[in-house]
Interface confidence: low
């Protein structure tokens, strides 16, 4: 009778094991082991027992002990089971961004590993098991479907293999894949709202605002604002699930015409875009031209108003005849025209909007000087010792200098409050002088003495 010890062995791949072959007869003709494995016999006293070291065990094997005794030949097998953990445990690559509500398929591939009967594949979200299946096939593949939710944002998905050799008196060997970190997002189907001027004047600044609600996570949203080829640099304000991107846009003469304004919101691997057209125009203020800005009384003056070729002008409220970009009027300058404003208003239609521009010029009329009865009475009669203020106003542009003298030396205190005395009486010569000339006027002051009874 041949026996073998141990009858069952589990060992790591490439490992060694000692196998003892024994026989029940004292003097066996033969005692040995049959195996393709490298073997080394350990010398022992006696004939009925042999110990062999079997090495580099790479796969399951069944070495067979045999003996030949007088009563016949017999054999006994030992079962060697090799274990090894998988060479590769990997989740199939996936885009890190996944839209909420989408079904996400996780696929884990496992290469190698034995014994397969003890090898299990586990798909996990964090530490929560999603699926557990025995490893079957080479490579073994396990899949599961996950409905993507908001609260998965930042969650780690992984695949773990478990080689459970605890029933064989060993341990549980685990291998885990690199985690796949899921980033979930919600990008609404509605395009972003874009608020901007429909028309924009050259060499001015406009404000563009792009906003969108219902985003998740709003912190990950990217906003791209552009006018034509000009990339805008917005200030982005984030809310709970919304953002508002505000940018200043400056345009030059090179941008004149119709430009495309774009707002694109990129979140995850999706984007939403809104397009709008902005008309960039050039419209200088109209020009008001006076023959001369300063003329003498009686001079003929031409006032012209000129504007953008496509504009329509009115000059002092009177539309150009025919309606167009030019208007003019003629006048003979009078003192009443001094300081008169000539206002030109130009209107230009740009992309259905009416744009208005104004320009005003003032006319200066030189006249005078003037001294007349109304503003400089020729006769004053005042009671003696009364308080009086002699008034005499000279008119003209420029404003004349006024002096009133009696006998060429004694001044009349114009505009000052005085106590009337006898020596105030007399005839004064008032002289108004300016660059435009000189006028004189006689003013008589009579002083009434009090009557004594």
């Amino acid at each position: 009778q041949t026996s073998v010890s141990p009858s069952k062995v589990i060992l790591p791949r490439g490992g060694s094991v000692l196998v003892t072959c024994s026989t029940s007869c004292d003097q066996p003709k033969l005692l040995g082991i049959e195996t393709p494995l490298p073997k080394k016999e350990l010398l022992l006293p006696g004939n009925n027992r042999k110990v062999y070291e079997l090495s580099n065990v790479q796969e399951d094997s069944q070495p067979m002990c045999y003996s030949n005794c007088p009563d016949g030949q017999s054999t006994a097998k030992t079962f060697l089971t090799v274990y090894w953990t998988p060479e590769r445990v990997e989740l199939a690559p996936l885009p890190s961004w996944q839209p909420v509500g989408k079904n996400l398929t996780l696929r884990c591939q496992v290469e190698g590993g034995a014994p397969r009967a003890n090898l299990t594949v586990v798909l996990l979200r964090g530490e929560k098991e999603l699926k557990r299946e025995p490893a079957v096939g080479e490579p073994a593949e396990v899949t599961t479907t996950v409905l993507v939710r908001r609260d998965h944002h930042g969650a780690n998905f992984s695949c773990r293999t478990e080689l459970d050799l605890r029933p064989q008196g060993l341990e549980l060997f685990e291998n885990t894949s690199a985690p796949y970190q899921l980033q979930t997002f919600v990008l609404p189907a509605t395009p972003p709202q874009l608020v901007s001027p429909r028309v924009l004047e050259v060499d001015t600044q406009g404000t563009v605002v792009c906003s969108l609600d219902g985003l998740f996570p709003v912190s990950e949203a990217q906003v791209h604002l552009a006018l034509g080829d000009q990339r805008l640099n917005p200030t982005v304000t984030y809310g709970n699930d919304s953002f508002s991107a505000k940018a200043s846009v400056s345009v030059t003469a090179e941008d004149e015409g119709t430009q495309r304004l774009t707002c694109a919101v990129i979140l995850g691997n999706q984007s939403q875009e809104t397009l709008q057209t902005v008309t960039i125009y050039s419209f200088p203020a109209p020009n008001v031209i006076l023959t001369k800005p300063e003329v003498s009384e009686g001079t003929e003056v031409t006032v012209k108003c000129e504007a953008h070729p496509r504009a329509k002008v009115t000059l002092n409220g009177v539309p150009a005849q025919p309606l167009g970009p030019r208007a003019q009027l003629l006048l003979k300058a009078t003192p009443e025209d001094n300081g008169r404003s000539f206002s030109c208003s130009a209107t230009l239609e740009v992309a259905g909007q009416l744009i208005h521009k104004n320009q005003t010029r003032e006319l200066r009329v030189l006249y005078g000087p003037r001294l007349d009865e109304r503003d400089c009475p020729g006769n004053w009669t005042w009671p003696e010792n009364s308080q009086q203020t002699p008034m005499c106003q000279a008119w003209g542009n420029p404003l004349p200098e006024l002096k009133c003298l009696k006998d060429g030396t004694f001044p009349l205190p114009i505009g000052e409050s005085v106590t009337v005395t006898r020596d105030l009486e007399g005839t004064y010569l008032c002289r108004a002088r300016s660059t435009q000339g000189e006028v004189t006027r006689k003013v008589t002051v009579n002083v009434l003495s009090p009557r004594y009874e």
Epitope: S96, K128, R149, D151, H152, H153, G154, Q181, N240
Partner: antibody, heavy 119, light 111 residues
């Protein structure tokens, strides 16, 4: 508006357990996770862990495993934090906060629950 | 665990001053997706913390633009351009790139 209403202060004896609550309102409760944070004089602010309001999935700071248990009742929009085998070291203010699973910041916080462990 | 170190511990300021708070992490906070998940919170006396800035430089809803954040990797800064009375309190930085999430020790902004 978003609100996280926490249960009132607790004065308990050492060795017992306590369960504090955090009720969310003003938003879709299951769309967010609830994080728990401990504030103590000794350690400032410490993250205890996070629980998915939808699935009940949890991720604990290793330091609080065995001490803290997070649960959720989505029918009442309420998250719970249970602290076991209390000692004076557990005396602190505990906050719940709304956030994403792991990466996102905590955009809204509860008012805090003061826990005093004393014999 | 990632250790977050804030400085200074206390920051005395006058109203209208600029204030600057530094936060350093023991590991890079650059996530595999390229983002730095570094956030700033303000806790006023007797209140819960409130989110000011998330992901380094994004102001949260309702946070005035005098608050700004910058930095990448391991060095981050919070700046307040003109301190107002309502800004006083303890400022915390926090990271969520690595698990467990961790907080800085806090910087007290006081008059």
């Amino acid at each position: 508006q978003v609100q996280l209403q926490q249960s009132g202060p607790e004065l308990v004896r050492p060795g017992v357990s306590v369960k504090i609550s955090c009720k969310g309102s003003g938003y879709t409760f299951i769309d967010y996770a609830i994080h728990w944070v401990k504030e103590s004089h000794a350690k400032s602010l410490e993250w205890i862990g996070v629980i998915s309001a939808y699935s009940g999935d949890t991720n604990y700071n290793q330091k609080f495993k065995g001490k803290a248990t997070m649960t959720v009742d989505k029918s009442s929009n309420t998250a719970y934090l249970e602290l076991a085998r209390l000692t004076s070291e557990d005396s602190a203010i505990y906050y719940c906060a709304r956030g994403g699973w792991l990466l996102l910041s905590f955009d809204y916080w509860g008012q805090g629950t003061t826990l005093t462990v004393s014999s | 665990d990632v250790v977050m170190t804030q400085s200074p511990l206390s920051l005395p300021v006058s109203l209208g001053d600029q204030a600057s708070i530094s936060c350093r992490s023991s590991q890079s906070l650059v996530h595999s997706n390229g983002n730095n998940y570094l956030h700033w919170y303000l806790q006023k006396s007797g209140q819960a913390p409130k989110l000011l800035i998330y992901k380094v430089s994004n102001r949260f809803s309702g946070v005035p633009d005098r608050f700004s954040g910058s930095g990448s990797g391991t060095d981050f800064t919070l700046k307040i351009s003109r301190v107002e009375a309502e800004d006083l309190g303890v400022y915390f930085c926090s990271q969520s790139t690595h698990v467990p999430l961790t907080f800085g020790g806090g910087t007290k902004l006081e008059i």
